[in-house]
Amino acid sequence: ADPGKKFKNSTYSRSSVDVLYTFANCSGLDLIFGLNALLRTADLQWNSSNAQLLLDYCSSKGYNISWELGNEPNSFLKKADIFINGSQLGEDFIQLHKLLRKSTFKNAKLYGPDVGQPRRKTAKMLKSFLKAGGEVIDSVTWHHYYLNGRTATKEDFLNPDVLDIFISSVQKVFQVVESTRPGKKVWLGETSSAYGGGAPLLSDTFAAGFMWLDKLGLSARMGIEVVMRQVFFGAGNYHLVDENFDPLPDYWLSLLFKKLVGTKVLMASVQGSKRRKLRVYLHCTNTDNPRYKEGDLTLYAINLHNVTKYLRLPYPFSNKQVDKYLLRPLGPHGLLSKSVQLNGLTLKMVDDQTLPPLMEKPLRPGSSLGLPAFSYSFFVIRNAKVAACI
Amino acid sequence: ADPGQDVVDLDFFTQEPLHLVSPSFLSVTIDANLATDPRFLILLGSPKLRTLARGLSPAYLRFGGTKTDFLIFDPKKE
C-alpha cells in the first residue's frame, strides 16, 4: 500500500529554538539544526522562506548554529510521496549556502545530505547530490543502523556478523565521496543500534554497548570524522539518558570514551584467525585527561567470546603500567541490565550537578589484560612514549 | 583453569596516525520529534540533563530526524 503522507506538519516557536540553543550552549555542545527540505515550490524547488524566518530570528539573537537541510531524502518518496533527486537537493543546498553567506551566518557550517544507508538508489542520490552541491557542504553526512528495532534480538546485538556489516556500508560511502568530492570529510550524522526507536529491552542495556563501542572504533579506524549518536535524550529505547534523566550504560561508555580516547587513530589487531569476536582499537590517549600525558596509548577492546580472554601487549609496551577501565553489567539481568559497573564500582551520579569520578584500576606492569566474557574495557598504556602521539 | 589457551597476542601499528578524528568525534542528537512534546521546554531545562550533556563536551548536538521535514518555524507562535 502507498504509505505517503504518514507525517503531519507541526509548528515550533521561538521559545523552542531558545531552549534548544540554551541547552546546547550551557552544556558546551555545538548545535546543528536540521531545516525542513520538504517545503517546496510547485516545480519542486526548495522554498527557503521559512528557513529565512528562522535564520533571521537566530541572527537577531546572536546564536552560533550550524545547519543541515533535510533528513534521509532517499525516503521522501515513502514519507511524503515526493521524489527529490540528488541534483535537485544539491541545488537546494547551494541556495541555502547563499542564504547563509548573506546573513550574519557567513561562517556557519553546512552539513548534508543526511542520506540513509548506501543502498543502490541511495548511493546514486548521494553521488548526484555531491556532484551538484558537494562544494558547499563542510562534511558529508549519512545514517546507519544495524537492525530493525521491532525484530532485533539479543543474539543480533552480540553477533560479529552484524557488527561487520557496518564495514561495507562505510566503504560504499567513501567510494562515492572519493569519486565525486575526494578528501571531503565524512560524518555519521545519525546512528544507533536499531531504527524505529531502538530495540525494546536491548538498546538501553549493557548489551547495546558492544555495537556502540565497535561502531566508534570502526568509524575512527576507517576515517569517519564525527559520529552522532541517536539519541542523547528522548523517546524510544536508544537514548543515552532515560526519561527520568538517569544515565544508561551507553552514556557511561560514551563518557569513558570521551575522557580516555584521543583524536589520533592508530591500529591494533589480534594475531591469528579468531579475530571477529575479540575486537580491538587503538588511539593516542586524550591528553585533556590530567592523569595522562602525551605519548600514552588508549586501547579499547570488546570480548564477544563466552570465556575470558587475556590480551598480551606487543613489545615495547608489554612492561608498561596499564590502567584498566572495565565495564560490566550490574545485577541479575546480566547483559540486559540498565546499570553498569566500572572496575566493580557502580556508576551513578553523585547528585544532579555532579558526575562520579571514573576510577581506574592500575595493573601490575607485565601482566596480561584480562577481558571477561561479554564485556568491554579501556586500557590506558601509561608512559608509552609513542612518537606519533606527541 | 589454565588461562594459557585464552591468551591473545596483539599487534600495534603506532608509527603514524591512520586518521585524525574531530575532538567532537563522539557527538549526540536530539530527535526533532521532541520539539512536538509539550514538555520540551521543561525537559531541556533540567539541570541534571545539562550536567550529563556537559560530560560529553566537546560534542555536536544535532537536532534532526524524520520530523525535520515536517516542522515549520512560526515566529508568531507563543
Partner: antibody, heavy 117, light 107 residues
C-alpha cells in the same frame, strides 16, 4: 488507487519481436524506478530490467542484454519493454512493477508472452 | 550474481501452525532483502522489506528477521489465506535475484 496494467503479450515465433506496455495510474509515475519481472510457466520469479525515473539509467539481467530494451514515457505514464530476437526460454508471464529501494510494492496483473513455432 | 537459496522448497502445515522459511544469500547483503507472497494466477505481493519491516496492510502474523547472509520469514499462526508460494529477493546489487520459492500447502 495505484494501478499498473500490462498489455502487448501474445504468441510470437522464435526470432520475432514484441513490445510490451504498462499503463500506470494513481501515483506520480515520474518519481519511481520501474521494473519488468517475468515468470516462466510453473517456475519462479526472474527480474528482467529496471529503469531510472527519468530514463537515464537502465539495468538488465544478463540473459536479455542486447535483445530487450526498457523505456518509459513519463508524459504518458507508460513503461515499455521492446523484446527482439525472442527465444523459447523467454516464454513467461511478464509483470511490470513499481520499484523502491527495498523491493517492489505494486505489480500489474501480468501479460503472457509465448514464444513458439 | 548473488544467489539466494530458500529452504524448504515445499512445506505442509495446518491452520494455526507457526511456520518459518529461511533464505540464505551467497554473500552478505546487509538487510537488503524482501519477501513476497504469490497465489496461483496472481501477481506477487510484497510482505516484508528491509529484511524485517512489515509492508503496510500486511497482517502482523508475518515477520522477517536476519541480516548479512541468513534471513527468515515467520508466520506466527497460519491462516487459510496464507497457503501460497513465498519468495525472497535481494536488492543489494544488480542483478536483482530471487530465491527459488517455497510452496506452502495445507497438510
Amino acid at each position: 488507487e495505484v494501478q499498473l496494467v500490462e498489455s502487448g503479450g501474445g504468441l510470437v515465433q522464435p526470432g520475432g519481436s514484441l513490445r510490451l506496455s504498462c499503463a500506470a495510474s494513481g501515483f506520480t509515475f515520474s518519481s519511481y524506478w520501474m521494473s519488468w519481472v517475468r515468470q516462466a510457466p510453473g517456475k519462479g520469479l526472474e527480474w528482467v530490467a529496471s529503469i531510472y525515473q527519468d530514463g537515464s539509467e537502465k539495468y538488465y539481467v544478463d540473459s536479455v542484454k542486447g535483445r530487450f530494451t526498457i523505456s518509459r514515457d513519463n508524459a504518458k505514464n507508460s513503461l515499455y519493454l521492446q523484446m527482439n530476437s525472442l527465444r523459447a526460454e523467454d516464454t513467461a508471464m511478464y509483470y511490470c512493477a513499481r520499484e523502491l529501494d527495498w523491493g517492489w510494492d505494486y505489480w500489474g496483473q501480468g501479460t503472457l508472452v509465448t514464444v513458439s513455432s | 550474481a548473488i544467489q539466494l537459496t530458500q529452504s524448504p522448497s515445499s512445506l505442509s502445515a495446518s491452520v494455526g501452525d507457526r511456520v518459518t522459511i529461511t533464505c540464505r544469500a551467497s554473500q552478505g547483503i546487509s538487510s537488503a532483502l524482501a519477501w513476497y507472497q504469490q497465489k496461483p494466477g496472481k501477481a506477487p505481493k510484497l510482505l516484508i522489506y528491509d529484511a524485517s519491516s512489515l509492508e503496510s496492510g500486511v497482517p502482523s502474523r508475518f515477520s522477517g528477521s536476519g541480516s548479512g547472509t541468513d534471513f527468515t520469514l515467520t508466520i506466527s499462526s497460519l491462516q487459510p489465506e496464507d497457503f501460497a508460494t513465498y519468495y525472497c529477493q535481494q536488492f543489494n546489487s544488480y542483478p536483482i535475484t530471487f530465491g527459488q520459492g517455497t510452496r506452502l500447502e495445507i497438510k
